[in-house]
Amino acid sequence: QDKPFLSAWPGTVVSEGQHVTLQCRSRLGFNEFSLSKEDGMPVPELYNRIFRNSFLMGPVTPAHAGTYRCCSSHPHSPTGWSAPSNPVVIMVTGVHRKPSLLAHPGPLVKSGETVILQCWSDVRFERFLLHREGITEDPLRLVGQLHDAGSQVNYSMGPMTPALAGTYRCFGSVTHLPYELSAPSDPLDIVVVGLYGKPSLSAQPGPTVQAGENVTLSCSSRSLFDIYHLSREAEAGELRLTAVLRVNGTFQANFPLGPVTHGGNYRCFGSFRALPHAWSDPSDPLPVSVTGNSRHL
């Protein structure tokens, strides 16, 4: 009951060369504490030292990876110290090259449906970690499947809700050095769609344009969306614009596509700034076709 609470800020996954703050909270409010590392390489700066409130550790090296506990000063205990805290595992990233992270069938996931996150690498990683940005809990640990070309893991996530949506990265590690991780994969934004009514999408001057002509796509709704997202079928990225309140009471964003050379099917979505990974239903698709060009789509 007198165990203090150890936490790591901004999180337990730390890039090599960066710093991490270890904070030891005593429930009674005793400010002094000691730190110990249970496994891996020793960290000399911890030994025979008393810290106050928190300890800024770094620049972090692979030697800092491992399990930490703290004891807070405790005048009423026979030893003068509390029982050891909960363990905190510090994982150091950047030790191996980054894996790749993909979403199947794609990163826009209907509310209530399931998405498969696939992390793969040409390095033979026995373990993968999946981490969502802004979450301080330990990342999800997954067992990799080894094959001749490297390794991979598939993680089925769902049913999709705004709580699961966010920016994901994955890391790889090898069995004998479990807390020394690869560099992070490129970030993957998983978005839950279908939470709000669909906006309308229209084209000015119209959906059929001459090659090289300017076209503007307007996304609008009576919902109080802060942001609109425009996506083109078969393209990974999306354009993003802030919504503006129009005289007619709609919230609108105009996407100038500039001189167009190729058409395509466009959709737009609305979202709120407070929940950037939660989007509306998609607008009805708007086919933009380009004349005077050998390729219409």
Partner: antibody, heavy 119, light 107 residues
């Protein structure tokens, strides 16, 4: 349901002492830290100190050392705070407040006890 | 001890308004900041802990943010029952200290 029921208002003379109580129910008394907080009239809040009912361990705000003494009676699940050598500066509402295990020091509050020091 | 400087002291707003209160710590408190609401004649009630986490049962119109020394508490759409004094408090280092309070009044 967690409840912290504090003793009634006290009118005391300067130089005297007062002991106020915080009767708890709805949880295991010895598993949570009990803190005490002072609120002078129209002013902010000041942490006085905390006590661990499990072992009687205490931690005081230096400002209140010698002024406040925190104790518990585990058999009746009551926390006490005694204030001594009272002056008009000690006139205030005093709250007991329980922690939530580790996240927050003041998760549940008693209704407060008004102590008035007057000749 | 750590000083928590809270601003403004008073806020006069209409129902439906958005309200922001700020708290500045005299040194870094990481994210160890809580926010409390004290309605007239009542004891304080915990709203936000760890700077941005809503406590159990607290409506989602109440939000908090910040890290280090600068913290913000927001009521997205003020309601009549939000009439109260709001306090920030640092949980980082004892003695635990509170801001001076912001009195929210509804027009």
């Amino acid at each position: 349901e967690v409840q912290l029921q504090q003793s009634g208002p006290e009118l005391v003379k300067p130089g005297a002492s007062v002991k106020i109580s915080c009767k708890t129910s709805g949880y295991t008394f010895t598993e949570y830290i009990m803190h005490w907080v002072k609120q002078s009239h129209g002013k902010s809040l000041e942490w006085i100190g905390g006590i661990n009912p499990n072992n009687g361990g205490t931690n005081y705000n230096q400002k209140f050392k010698g002024k406040a003494t925190l104790t518990v009676d585990t058999s009746s699940s009551i926390a006490y705070m005694e204030l001594r050598s009272l002056t008009s500066e000690d006139s205030a509402v005093y709250y007991c407040a329980r922690d939530d295990g580790y996240y927050v020091k003041f998760a549940y509050w008693g209704q407060g006890t008004l102590v008035t020091v007057s000749a | 001890s750590i000083v928590m400087t809270q601003t403004p002291k008073f806020l006069l707003v209409s129902a439906g308004d958005r309200v922001t209160i700020t708290c500045k710590a005299s040194q870094s408190v990481i994210n160890d900041v809580a926010w409390y609401q004290q309605k007239p004649g009542q004891s304080p009630k915990l709203l936000i802990y760890y700077a941005s986490n809503r406590y159990t049962g607290v409506p989602d119109r109440f939000t908090g943010s910040g890290y280090g020394t600068d913290f913000t508490f927001t009521i997205s759409t003020v309601q009549a029952e939000d009439l109260a004094v709001y306090f920030c408090q640092q949980d980082y280092s004892s003695p635990f200290t509170f801001g001076s309070g912001t009195k929210l009044e509804i027009k």
